[in-house]
């Protein structure tokens, strides 16, 4: 069996996780993609998914999670804003490919969110929290429910699956950008 590897990221409450998951462009550009959490002893749970077929660069927001699939680059950008301590856990990007089970994109992400200000050099430590204005977006497709012997992904609660968000406000203080693919200049 393939050994599953993890990348660990330690962030502070209020920061933003910004991950780019790369996939094989030719095979998966239009495939529906999802962001999942894997809790100890439980099957992976789908927190958010792109539309089906996945639209190029179309932002899909579910709560504090924003997904953007960039077909030109074979990259799924995942942002989790206003991180909370309880967001700590193991996450993964997957590609839905029914009737086969989801294809996991390496590596898994071990997120550790701790309390306290980030103290990022150059950031304003005395500033009050800033408001993150989420533009209205709508996800048309429900995240599918899979039940396979090795991997099960559950659909999120109904309230988060079919979302229309009119100017939600999320408190946000800082962002840590995680680039998991090479960037050329």
């Amino acid at each position: 069996a393939t050994k599953l590897t993890e990348e660990k990221y330690e962030l502070k409450e209020g920061q933003t996780l910004d991950v780019k998951c790369d996939y094989t462009l030719e095979k998966f550009a239009s495939s529906q993609k999802a962001w999942q959490i894997i809790r100890d002893g439980e099957m992976p749970k789908t927190l958010a998914c792109t539309e089906r077929p996945s639209k190029n660069s179309h932002p899909v927001q579910v709560g504090r999670i924003i997904l953007e699939d960039y077909h030109d680059h074979g990259l799924l950008r995942v942002r989790m804003v206003n991180l909370q301590v309880e967001d700590s856990g193991l996450y993964q990007c997957v590609i839905y490919q029914p009737p086969k089970e989801p294809h996991m994109l390496f590596d898994r992400i071990r997120l550790v969110v701790t309390k306290g200000f980030s103290g990022t050099p150059g950031s304003n430590e005395n500033s009050t929290q800033n408001v993150y204005k989420i533009p209205p977006t709508t996800t048309k497709a429900l995240c599918p429910l899979y039940t396979s012997p090795r991997t099960v992904t559950q659909a999120p609660p109904k309230s988060t699956a079919d979302v229309s968000t009119p100017d939600s406000e999320i408190n946000l203080t800082n962002v840590t950008d995680i680039i998991r693919v090479p960037v050329f200049n």
Epitope: T16, D18, N56, S57, E68, Y70, H71, D72, H73, L75, R77, V81, G122, N130, V131, Y132, K133, L172, T173, N174, V175, T176, D177, V183, F184, N185
Partner: antibody, heavy 121, light 107 residues
Framework: QVQLQESGPGLVKPSETLSLTCAVS?????????WAWIRQPPGKGLEWIGS???????YYNPSLKSRVTISVDTSKNQFSLKLSSVTAADTAVYYC??????????????WGQGTLVTVSS | EIVMTQSPATLSVSPGERATLSCRAS??????LAWYQQKPGQAPRLLIY???TRATGIPARFSGSGSGTEFTLTISSLQSEDFAVYYC?????????FGGGTKVEIK
């Protein structure tokens, strides 16, 4: 080095369509990067109009989206801007520029020298 | 869209002095911020991208710092050719947005 040169009419009548072309030299558009149009009304600040990738994927400023079309011609190594239903408020210096390699690396370098487009009857 | 606010609108500095320009984003943009210099009748010139990386050919007296929502451009010792308008721009998400600019003038 990479150079960009805007061309197109300097005077457009209200309600007509503004059309500009940006010729790129020293770099092949099809090699990557985003290519952008930015404008600057006289005495004012900068406004991003939109960007295009060599694949043809386009990204527009929502404030202009209904009127803007950006296209690319890789065979001529150029990209173009069309802005419909123009008014006096669209009078500006229009710049073309090379963006970054990814959507989140959207800085602009280098820039064309800019071309002033006046909307007037 | 993300609103970028620059301050001050005008900065009067003597040659050889240090200039500090500020830029604030209405929401966090990580380190995805650029700075440009524009002189009258010219196109803007990229100085800094990624909040702190100097563009090719930019003198070391220009430095950028900050992350999240608060950013600073510092010109350590102003030269005569540095008097211009400076713009910040977030390059994190569409639509890309610019600040209103800071004019650095001779005191």
């Amino acid at each position: 080095q990479v150079q960009l040169q805007e061309s197109g009419p300097g005077l457009v009548k209200p309600s007509e369509t503004l059309s500009l072309t940006c010729a790129v030299s020293g770099y092949s558009i099809s090699s990557g990067y985003y290519w952008a149009w930015i404008r600057q009304p006289p005495g004012k600040g900068l406004e991003w109009i939109g960007s295009i990738y060599h694949s043809g994927s386009t990204y527009y400023n929502p404030s202009l989206k209904s009127r803007v079309t950006i296209s690319v011609d890789t065979s001529k190594n150029q990209f173009s801007l069309k802005l419909s239903s123009v008014t006096a408020a669209d009078t500006a210096v229009y710049y073309c520029a090379r963006g970054g390699p990814y959507p989140w690396s959207g800085w602009f370098d280098p820039w064309g020298q800019g071309t002033l487009v006046t909307v007037s009857s | 869209e993300i609103v970028m606010t620059q301050s001050p609108a005008t900065l009067s500095v003597s040659p050889g002095e240090r200039a500090t320009l500020s830029c604030r984003a209405s929401q966090s943009v990580g380190s995805n911020l650029a700075w440009y210099q524009q002189k009258p009748g010219q196109a803007p010139r990229l100085l800094i991208y990624g909040a702190s990386t100097r563009a090719t050919g930019i003198p070391a007296r220009f430095s950028g710092s900050g992350s999240g929502t608060e950013f600073t451009l510092t010109i350590s010792s102003l030269q005569s050719e540095d008097f211009a308008v400076y713009y910040c721009q977030q390059h994190d998400v569409w639509p890309y947005t610019f600040g209103g600019g800071t004019k650095v003038e001779i005191k």
